[in-house]
Amino acid sequence: LTCLGGFASPGPVPPSTALRELIEELVNITQNQKAPLCNGSMVWSINLTAGMYCAALESLINVSGCSAIEKTQRMLSGFCPHKVSAGQFSSLHVRDTKIEVAQFVKDLLLHLKKLFREGQFN
């Protein structure tokens, strides 16, 4: 994570800052939401455990044409050590439930804020 740069500030970014920036972006999405986020698109629910960042990206990357989450997708790619492309589900171990993108973002935000408060930045 110390090499995360490019989505907010130049050069290396401390892990705590990278996580903060992702949280801020998700907060902005939830607070600025007027119409249904991404036209109510559905994505696979994920287990918020190890490999969560890659799983989140694999789920969200299948939503196309939604500018509101493009920055989130870019940020998540900085947290995921491997390249993720649409239709790839290597980190999504369980694919049994689909939820709206708005709910996905809320769930992810709550979990990331808990990790931040606990000091778990990696």
Epitope: T17, R20, I23, V27, K113, R117
Partner: antibody
Framework: EVTLKESGPVLVKPTETLTLTCTFS??????????VDWIRQPPGKALEWLAH???????RYNPALKSRLTISKDTSKSQVVLTMTNMDPVDTATYYC???????????????WGQGTTVTVSS | DIQMTQSPSSLSASVGDRVTITCRAS??????LNWYQRKPGKVVKLLIY???KLHSGVPSRFSGSGSGTDFTLTISSLQPEDVATYYC?????????FGGGTKVEIK
């Protein structure tokens, strides 16, 4: 109206354990995003953050004092308790509790404070 | 730990004056800077959070600015009730740290 009040001994002896209680009203520590912090200010010195506890029992401590501090909450009594072991004269200070809220961004801003309680460490 | 340096440590100004207090962080804290006011014999009050957001009930003569490492608290027109000590605090990284305070008096 949000209020917080600190209570505890005025005088403690060196090596003893200090127990401070923060009793609050106007909010609940069972409500999402709520937290309570402890801060102190020795005479003539800067404010120093000690610890905080969140509604979901996540606890964080100042690393410089972590081995001596324990923070806990009793939601039903609307109280947060801080214990500090092995007290020393340099721990003489006014101790404050304050509320913090993490809705939206996590600002770590303390929006309501107690009046403070002065603790003197002396034999 | 992030060191917070406030200046001046004290100042004296006339009613109606524009007063500026600065706070410098030893490293980048982005916009996570909060300002507090402690009046003699009163509880500490949050004035401004996240650099420039006014806490509820705070008069509009108070404002904050800055980013990164350098921040400013401004009182646009000093009032007698503004006599107090003002503290900055960084909320970016634990442990949370405070500036040494600025005591504001009326000439």
């Amino acid at each position: 109206e949000v209020t917080l009040k600190e209570s505890g001994p005025v005088l403690v002896k060196p090596t003893e354990t200090l127990t401070l209680t923060c009793t609050f009203s106007g909010f609940s520590l069972s409500t999402s995003d709520m937290g309570v912090d402890w801060i102190r200010q020795p005479p003539g010195k800067a404010l120093e953050w000690l610890a905080h506890i969140w509604w979901d029992d996540v606890k964080r401590y100042n690393p410089a004092l972590k081995s001596r501090l324990t923070i806990s909450k009793d939601t039903s009594k609307s109280q947060v308790v801080l214990t500090m072991t092995n007290m020393d004269p340099v721990d003489t200070a006014t101790y404050y509790c304050a509320r913090t809220v993490s809705s939206g961004y996590i600002y770590y801003a303390m929006d309501y404070w107690g009046q403070g309680t002065t603790v003197t460490v002396s034999s | 730990d992030i060191q917070m340096t406030q200046s001046p440590s004290s100042l004296s100004a006339s009613v109606g004056d524009r007063v500026t207090i600065t706070c410098r962080a030893s490293q980048d804290i982005r916009n996570y800077l909060n300002w507090y006011q402690r009046k003699p014999g009163k509880v500490v009050k949050l004035l401004i959070y996240y650099t420039s957001k006014l806490h509820s009930g705070v008069p509009s003569r108070f404002s904050g600015s800055g980013s990164g490492t350098d921040f400013t608290l401004t009182i646009s027109s000093l009032q007698p009730e503004d006599v107090a000590t003002y503290y900055c605090q960084q909320g970016n990284t634990l442990p949370l740290t405070f500036g040494g305070g600025t005591k504001v008096e009326i000439k």
